[in-house]
């Protein structure tokens, strides 16, 4: 008949499993329970996947691995005797008197419950990596953490290569024995120990459970170190950079940590497993019963088969590992789980030209000299699209792309951003807002919804802020409705007249050039260069200023660059920025200074795009370590990452304007990186590519 094979990971667990099997059999519980011996939780997961076992209880990290790598699903969850049900919360605690926030943890002293412990290590480290605050090169998480904090106590890290830093704050017992042991010998071990490390001033932040502070303050603790501690003297660090009272852990935490759960193969009936265990817990979970499901005392161990603190087992409704773990914990695990043995030795970078091949070759050599991992290899392609194809086909791994190409890479080829470029705050030519500028005119004021029949000024055909975004946005919002994919004709019929300078026109609608003026002699009308006086962002604004047009589609800086004395040309010399306004997508008008809230889209920075199965944290980890050495254009280390002047080119591998490579943080998809408005505009345009 039917049987369920439970996987045990040790002799004591096998012993308890045998007793449980016997107890269930005697009670007539069906299906029958058998026990299979595995060597570890990982081994058991492999046995279940191979259909040699059926079930095991796992912690969050193991559920993540089992689900992601082997397709197992959680079907029964543990509930513990506490108010938060099937989970608890991992928090970061600081002294109220300190000024530490989640964004200023670099260099502070840290207290952890123990190496590889959930709230003391896995969640905080995973969260810091996943959020981009902590960069990890070559999967060496221990090195990354030891470099990040200004000394730590991580009980159990004494056997690692980074014990000097990771055990620096540990003190052992009263006689100095057991320093950094993953045991009560180390006074700063476990939840209370990590909190003590903070309370005694050894560390500046403690990574503990939501209940730890309240359990060890306000006279609730017996040991002398905690007697005088007040919970009000401590605060929690929130993910958004703020801080909160220690009672606010539901809103302010690093992650909700899921309870342990029973996992099975995807084809196993979860209801059957719950019915089996539910029968068992009904008979064998209370005091005095012949077998104790939720106790391990009799076997001289803790947490065998189930956690000893389990009060009951409950069925899991949505049987996916993602739903059970929750997005916070899931994200933290993504940041943490990096197997050095599965890390490819090379990162193959896509290059598009001879100068780029040369720069990439030099980068590979420079990185190798500094032992940066993974090593760079250079693979050439004919075009950005060809790069995308080759990345999808696993012939290449990474390429830096512009906004429009990121859209194609994500939408058509399924690629994701692994790192982004960051430009100087004052650099408006590389990442900027697209705005619709109008004259301030109370008598003839119109809104973005009333552009039909108006005269429009554009920097040029195909320019991001002058054409792609505004036209895409108007198509997406349903104002412009191209027939037969003919966007040009549709735009020409939407506006009364326009100036949209163009190079090498073919069949170009005349009304798109009707407002253009050409050069001083009236020649070169509508040409896509500066001979046309209304060409470019400055020219489009001039078209508005000189009353040729009613609206100009430009960058957010264009008005400032050409008013209040910033442009001495006769047409601009007397202009004042307050005489102009912006049209907002919500139908309002706004001051030109309100561009961040009133724009058609933000043109995103370039990003490094990879396959979704590529570990983005190792890509960013490599680039982050590399830029410490090679990021400054004046560095003396023999290679300049963000400068192409040695190669007689520009923007090779990265834009020359890049100041730093940055993590993608939450923007882990092409849509997230590009932003909804920009994507909407591109979708408006791409809907017309027939």
């Amino acid at each position: 008949g039917m049987e369920v094979r439970w996987c045990a990971t040790s002799d004591p667990e096998q012993h308890k499993c045998g007793n449980m099997s016997e107890a269930f059999r005697e009670a007539g519980i069906q299906p029958s329970l058998l026990c299979v011996r595995g060597t570890s939780a990982d081994h058991c997961v492999q046995l279940i996947a191979a259909q040699e076992a059926d079930a095991i209880t796992l912690d969050g990290g193991a559920i993540y691995e089992a689900g992601k790598e082997h397709g197992l699903k959680p079907v029964v969850g543990e509930v513990y005797d506490q108010e938060v049900g099937t989970s608890y919360y991992a928090v970061a605690v600081v002294r109220r008197s300190s000024h530490v926030t989640i964004d200023t943890l670099k260099g502070v002293k840290s207290c952890h419950t123990g190496i590889n412990r959930t709230v003391g290590w896995n969640v905080p480290v995973g969260y810091l990596v996943e959020s981009g605050r902590l960069s990890v090169m070559g999967c060496d998480v221990l090195k990354a953490v030891s470099d990040y904090f200004g000394g730590s106590c991580v009980p159990g890290a004494g056997e690692t290569s980074y014990s000097e830093s990771l055990c620096r704050l540990c003190r052992g017992d009263s006689s100095g024995e057991g320093v950094c042991d993953k045991s009560p010998l180390e006074r700063y071990y476990d939840y209370s120990g990590a909190f003590r490390c903070l309370a005694e001033g050894a560390g500046d932040v403690a990574f503990v459970k939501h209940s730890t502070v309240l359990e060890n303050t306000d006279g609730k603790t017996l040991p002398s170190w905690g007697q005088a501690l007040l919970s009000q003297d401590f605060e929690l660090l929130c993910r958004d950079g703020s801080r909160a009272d220690v009672t606010e852990w539901r809103q302010c935490h690093l992650a909700r940590v899921p309870a342990h759960a029973v996992v099975v193969r995807a084809d196993t009936d979860g209801g059957l497993i719950f019915r089996l265990l539910n029968e068992g817990q009904r008979l064998f979970s209370h005091e005095g019963s012949s077998f104790q499901m939720f106790s391990s005392e009799a076997y001289g161990q803790k947490d065998l088969l189930f956690k000893d603190s389990t009060s009951e087992l409950v069925p899991i409704a949505t049987q996916t590992y993602e739903a059970w773990l929750g997005h916070e914990y899931l994200h933290a695990m993504k940041g943490l789980l990096c197997d050095p043995n599965r890390l490819p030795p090379y990162l193959r970078w896509c290059v598009l030209s001879t100068p780029e091949i040369q720069k990439c070759g030099d980068m590979a050599v420079a990185f190798r000299r500094q032992r940066l991992k993974p090593e760079i290899q250079c693979v050439s392609a004919k075009s950005p699209q060809h790069c995308m194809e080759r990345i999808q086909a696993e012939q290449v791994d990474a390429v830096t792309l512009s906004g429009e190409d990121i859209y194609t890479a994500g939408k058509t080829y399924g690629l994701v951003p692994a790192a982004g470029e960051h430009y100087a705050p004052e650099d408006s030519s590389n990442s900027y807002y697209v705005v619709a500028v109008v004259r301030r005119d109370s008598s003839h004021a119109f809104t973005l919804d009333e552009l039909r029949g108006k005269r429009s000024c554009h920097a040029g055909f195909g320019s991001p802020a002058g054409w792609d975004v505004p036209v895409g946005a108007l198509i997406q919002r349903g104002f412009i409705r191209p027939k037969d994919c003919d966007v040009l004709t549709a735009v020409s019929e939407f506006f009364n007249a326009s100036c949209v300078p163009v190079n090498n026109p073919k069949n170009y609608p005349s009304s798109l050039c009707a407002l253009c003026v050409g050069d001083e002699q009236g020649r070169n009308k509508c040409v896509g260069n500066s001979q046309e006086r209304y060409y470019g962002y400055r020219g489009a604004f001039r078209c508005l200023v000189e009353n040729a047009g009613d609206v100009a589609f430009v960058r957010h800086t264009t008005v400032f660059d050409n008013t209040n004395g910033h442009n001495s040309e006769p047409w601009a010399a007397e202009l004042r920025s307050e005489d102009y306004e912006l049209l907002c997508p919500n139908g309002a008008r706004a001051e030109v200074s309100q561009f961040a809230a009133c724009n058609l889209a933000q043109i995103p920075p370039h990003a490094v795009m990879v396959r979704p199965d590529t570990n983005i944290f190792t890509v960013y980890g490599l680039l982050d370590k590399a830029q410490d050495l090679f990021g400054d254009d004046h560095n003396k280390n023999g290679f300049k990452m963000f400068d192409s002047s040695n190669y007689h080119g520009q923007d090779l591998l990265f834009k020359d304007a890049t100041v730093r490579a940055v993590p993608v943080g939450e923007k882990t998809t092409y849509r997230g990186w590009l932003g909804l408005d920009y994507v909407a505009a591109l979708e408006g345009m791409s809907s017309q590519q027939c």
Epitope: D486, P505, N507, S510, A514
Partner: antibody, heavy 118, light 107 residues
């Protein structure tokens, strides 16, 4: 050099159908619009409509909308103007003309004379 | 539709004369006006577009001017081969519309 060669003169009776052609050469046929223009005897020029040979999209002058059909076969670089039922008032010279940088007629064919008479 | 009104409908001139033809649009067409030349039994030829831009290969004696609603074609020194009918056309909005033509004849 750009050349537009139109089919020969036609003499038809009212009610008959007709399809005249215009073959483009010396350029990439699908890159430019093709227009049809009517010139009635001793009169001026009237724009009838155009086709984008790349995708077959057409645009008509309303007064000709239900009178004629414009089509193209890009495989043989040829555009067509056709009537399903001719009238005496369709007697005219018909020109095909290729667009240029802008979307109005630049280069013209030699014309096709259509005579409709009972 | 935009109406284009040409004047005169015909004129007589001698070789070497300066000839001016005007065209009026029924509404503002900015500078979107083209001029064509048509000789008897031949197809029209584009001379000028954007009111003043000469098409490739058109002699410099042909010039155009105007914007808004009023436009002019000027032949600075009439040559024997210039005797023909001239049409203006607005290329601002479809349907493209033509003037009724001006016939330039030998005096």
């Amino acid at each position: 050099e750009v050349q537009l060669v139109q089919s020969g003169a036609e003499v038809k009776k009212p009610g008959e159908s007709l399809k005249i052609s215009c073959k483009g050469s010396g350029y990439s046929f699908t890159d430019y619009y093709l227009h049809w223009v009517r010139q009635m005897p001793g009169k001026g020029l009237e724009w009838m409509g155009r086709i984008n040979p790349y995708n077959g999209a057409t645009s008509y002058n309303q007064i000709f909308k239900d009178q004629v059909t414009i089509s193209a076969d890009k495989s043989i670089s040829t555009a067509y103007l056709q009537w399903s039922s001719l009238k005496a008032s369709d007697t005219a010279m018909y020109y095909c003309a290729r667009g240029g940088d802008y979307d109005f007629p630049w280069y013209w064919g030699q014309g096709t004379t259509v005579t409709v008479s009972s | 539709d935009i109406q284009m009104t040409q004047s005169p409908s015909s004129l007589s001139a001698s070789v070497g004369d300066r000839v001016t033809i005007t065209c009026k649009a029924s509404q503002d067409v900015y500078a979107a006006v083209a001029w064509y030349q048509q000789k008897p039994g031949k197809a029209p030829k584009l001379l000028i577009y954007w009111a003043s831009t000469r098409h490739a290969g058109v002699p410099s004696r042909f010039s155009g001017s105007g914007s808004g609603t009023d436009f002019t074609l000027t032949i600075s020194s009439l040559q024997p081969e210039d005797f023909a009918t001239y049409y203006c056309q607005q290329h601002y909005r479809t349907p493209w519309t033509f003037g009724q033509g001006t016939k330039v004849e030998i005096k």
